[in-house]
């Protein structure tokens, strides 16, 4: 075209893929009549007529633009819809009169790439690799033009570095004309990179200006040899017998090496391998004092068969031995004295306490309990507790039963039992003494006896309520080598309907079962009389 060299630079029109480009013919009225214009597309320096304007009316030429062109702005503007990357070219309008002039428009097309997809090497990177390894890939799909990629480590851009960092980027053109960019970050990593955060950033342009998209941050599995091995014990602090103790071998390498834990044998002075679980953890459950000792861990690199040894760790499982009380089975006369002595061994300083079994009342702080002027009531249980104050829960106890010689002592002297004629009564009588008493009844029936403890006995009697029995009542007699004692049970007839739940009664030990005639289940409640002051 004559004089083309002097032509001004084309007007720049920027538009996003998929939108409409407005191509305004910039010819002035003097340069040409806009009611008579031809529009051309220029591709590889070849012009193709795409649209004609005659008397302000537009007509598309057959071809790739046929369906996408229309006139706007009273014929001065050509609208190109559904812009694609292939539309990035020069468009020109040419006026026909008074003389042929043309106006050029450079159409620039943009498309933001999709979010970058970052992927980490699924196998990880060994620090001793001879060459930079593929650390991660970054893919930005469907952008136009080709976006630029920047790799970041811990927020800082990564630069090419000979034999250390290499960034390899390539692109493919999709059938749509859009670009997919793939960037591979190759690097030689060091141990400190195990916590490093990597991400990639895509920089691209749109008509609105420069933009960027960042990938998610990723960490890379980094493999490095073990340099240090150590033992950890859980729980931390003082250990005691009965605890669940875990001895764990740890190493600063990745992947962790193969571990074995051994315990020093004090007698042979040799280390004996302990059986660990699948995770290389030695579990002592329950821990015993025999578990105390010197433990160490050996870590093996199965590739090189090099082994590392941990610092030995002394494990102390604190214990309290069985508690011994002397005398073990004390017997005393009323009015006499008794000294109870408690002994135990421990890995720590012990504290002793004496408690009354029945009440948990603390009687003495110390290993010796002295009892003077013993009464019958002093008989029963005494508990020695040996404990380690510095280790909560570490204690052992021993119970000793003190027997006071004396004739039988009845649980009650008299008792009134409400009954109904022809009922089978279940009567009970309790006595204590030393030596242990036996109980007899003054009426015939089925009696059974059971020990409550070495000095106490409970006898139960099943008996049929007869008029004679109502008359005489029932007696139980307890006897031992030192004497005898009796309790009386008075039987009184009751109409069951008079015994309401509100009745001010105390349920006693006696109940009646079915009558011999009907064998129907019915019960009788006994009423306790107020207990006398002396029960001896």
């Amino acid at each position: 075209v004559p004089g083309e060299a002097e032509q001004p630079a084309p007007e720049l029109v920027e538009v996003e893929v998929g939108s409409t480009a407005l191509l305004k013919c910039g010819l002035s009225q003097s340069q040409g009549n806009l009611s008579h214009v031809d529009w051309f597309s220029v591709h590889k320096e070849k012009r193709t007529l795409i649209f004609r304007v005659r008397q302000g009316q537009g007509q598309s030429e057959p071809g790739e633009y046929e369906q996408r062109l229309s006139l706007q702005d009273r014929g001065a503007t050509l609208a190109l819809t559904q812009v694609t990357p292939q539309d990035e070219r020069i468009f020109l309008c040419q006026g026909k009169r008074p003389r042929s002039q043309e106006y050029r428009i450079q159409l620039r097309v943009y498309k933001a790439p999709e979010e970058p997809n970052i992927q980490v090497n699924p196998l990880g990177i060994p620090v001793n690799s001879k060459e930079p390894e593929e650390v991660a890939t970054c893919v930005g799909r469907n952008g136009y033009p080709i976006p630029q990629v920047i790799w970041y480590k811990n927020g800082r851009p990564l630069k090419e570095e000979k034999n250390r960092v290499h960034i390899q980027s390539s692109q493919t053109v999709e059938s749509s004309g859009l670009y997919t960019l793939q960037s591979i970050l190759k690097a030689q990593l060091v141990k400190e990179d195990k916590d490093a955060q990597f991400y990639c950033e895509l920089n691209y342009r749109l008509p609105s200006g420069n933009h960027m998209k960042e990938s998610r941050e990723v960490t890379v599995p980094v493999f490095y040899p073990t340099e240090k091995v150590w033992l950890e014990v859980e729980p931390v602090g003082m250990l005691k017998e009965g605890d669940r103790v875990e001895i764990r071998c740890l190493a600063d390498g990745n992947p962790p090496p193969h571990f074995s834990i051994s315990k020093g044998n004090p007698s042979t002075r040799e280390a004996e391998e302990e059986t660990t679980n699948d995770n290389g953890v030695l579990v002592l459950e329950p821990a015993r004092k025999e578990h105390s000792g010197r433990y160490e861990c050996q870590a093996w690199n199965l590739d090189t068969m090099i082994s590392l040894l941990s610092e030995p760790q002394e494990l102390l499982v604190n214990y309290v031995s069985d508690v011994r009380v002397s005398p073990a089975a004390p017997e005393r006369q009323e009015g006499s004295s008794l000294t109870l002595t408690c002994e135990a061994e421990s890995s720590q300083d012990l504290e002793f306490q004496w408690l009354r079994e029945e009440t948990d009342q603390v009687l003495e702080r110390g290993p010796v309990l002295q009892l003077h002027d013993l009464k019958r009531e002093a008989g029963g249980g005494y508990r020695c507790v040996a404990s380690v104050p510095s280790i909560p829960g570490l204690n052992r106890t021993q119970l000793v039963k003190l027997a006071i010689f004396g004739p039988p002592w009845m649980a009650f002297k008299e008792r009134k039992v409400w009954v109904k004629e022809n009922m089978v009564l279940n009567l009970s009588c309790e006595a204590s003494g030393h030596p242990r008493p036996t109980i007899s009844w003054n009426v015939n029936g089925t009696a059974s006896e059971g020990d409550q403890d070495p000095q106490r006995v409970l006898s139960t009697l099943n008996v049929l309520v007869t008029p004679e029995l109502l008359e005489t009542g029932v007696e139980c007699t307890a006897s031992n080598d030192l004497g005898k004692n009796t309790s009386i049970l008075f039987l009184e007839l009751v109409n069951l309907t008079t015994l309401t739940p509100d009745s001010n009664t105390t349920t006693g030990l006696s109940t009646s079962t079915a009558s011999p005639h009907t064998r129907a289940n019915s019960t009788s409640t006994e009423r306790k009389l107020p207990e006398p002051e002396s029960r001896g």
Epitope: N117, P122, L123, E131, E133, E134, T137
Partner: antibody, heavy 116, light 106 residues
Framework: QVTLKESGPVLVKPTETLTLTCTVS????????VSWVRQPPGKALEWIAA???????YYNSAFKSRLSISRDTSKSQVVLTMTNMDPVDTATYYC??????????WGQGTLVTVSS | DIQMTQSPSSLSASVGDRVTITCKGS??????LAWFQLKPGKVPKLLIY???SLQTGIPSRFSGSGSGTDFTLTISSLQPEDVATYYC????????FGGGTKVEIK
């Protein structure tokens, strides 16, 4: 074009060592890693080992103590050795190219039978 | 280890049918998933990588979707030559495959 071809014995005895070779063409072993994958009859695919473009080696921990993978870049070969073979190791063994983390090209596989 | 659960284990469909195979990861693998086609005596073929990218030379009737833990391979119109066993594979952490889906023609 990219091709991979596995070769090695079709029959090995229990306790013996299996050596398989993967010969590649159309790419360089210093540009792409190679993995070995196997498929026992009627079962799923199972990754065995890999050697990266930088020469780092990786093993499936289920077989680690029995495996060794190496390469000869001048011959474009990757070699897998598996010791102490057992009848359960009977499978079709494949080698596959990494691009860079997925497998884009595979060999046709070689069936290895372990039997006495 | 990441487990990949594929379903169904087998299916039978007519030529022209739309076929869907699913793969579920035991943890988030983002888009690190590939689909392969295996035919007896043939070289295994990569169909899809990065969960939804079609490998060069693979017919467009194959497509992949999903991210995170749930993925799908779709054959929009089943063809006789698509009879094969299909496997998913994660490459997020190590390499593990699904159990496979055998596709047959009714």
């Amino acid at each position: 074009q990219v091709t991979l071809k596995e070769s090695g014995p079709v029959l090995v005895k229990p306790t013996e060592t299996l050596t398989l070779t993967c010969t590649v063409s159309g790419f360089s072993l210093t540009s792409n890693g190679v993995s070995w994958v196997r498929q026992p009859p009627g079962k799923a695919l199972e990754w065995i080992a890999a050697i990266s473009s930088g020469g780092s080696t990786y093993y499936n921990s289920a077989f680690k103590s029995r495996l060794s993978i190496s390469r000869d870049t001048s011959k474009s070969q990757v070699v897998l050795t598996m010791t102490n073979m057992d009848p359960v190791d009977t499978a079709t063994y494949y080698c596959a190219r990494h691009r860079p983390f997925y497998f884009d090209y595979w060999g046709q596989g070689t069936l290895v039978t372990v039997s006495s | 280890d990441i487990q990949m659960t594929q379903s169904p284990s087998s299916l039978s469909a007519s030529v022209g049918d739309r076929v869907t195979i699913t793969c579920k990861g035991s943890q988030n693998i983002y888009k690190s998933l590939a689909w392969f086609q295996l035919k007896p005596g043939k070289v295994p073929k990569l169909l899809i990588y990065d969960a939804n990218s079609l490998q060069t030379g693979i017919p467009s009737r194959f497509s992949g979707s999903g991210s995170g833990t749930d993925f799908t391979l779709t054959i929009s119109s089943l063809q006789p030559e698509d009879v094969a066993t299909y496997y998913c594979q994660q490459y997020y952490s190590g390499y593990t495959f699904g159990g496979g889906t055998k596709v047959e023609i009714k």
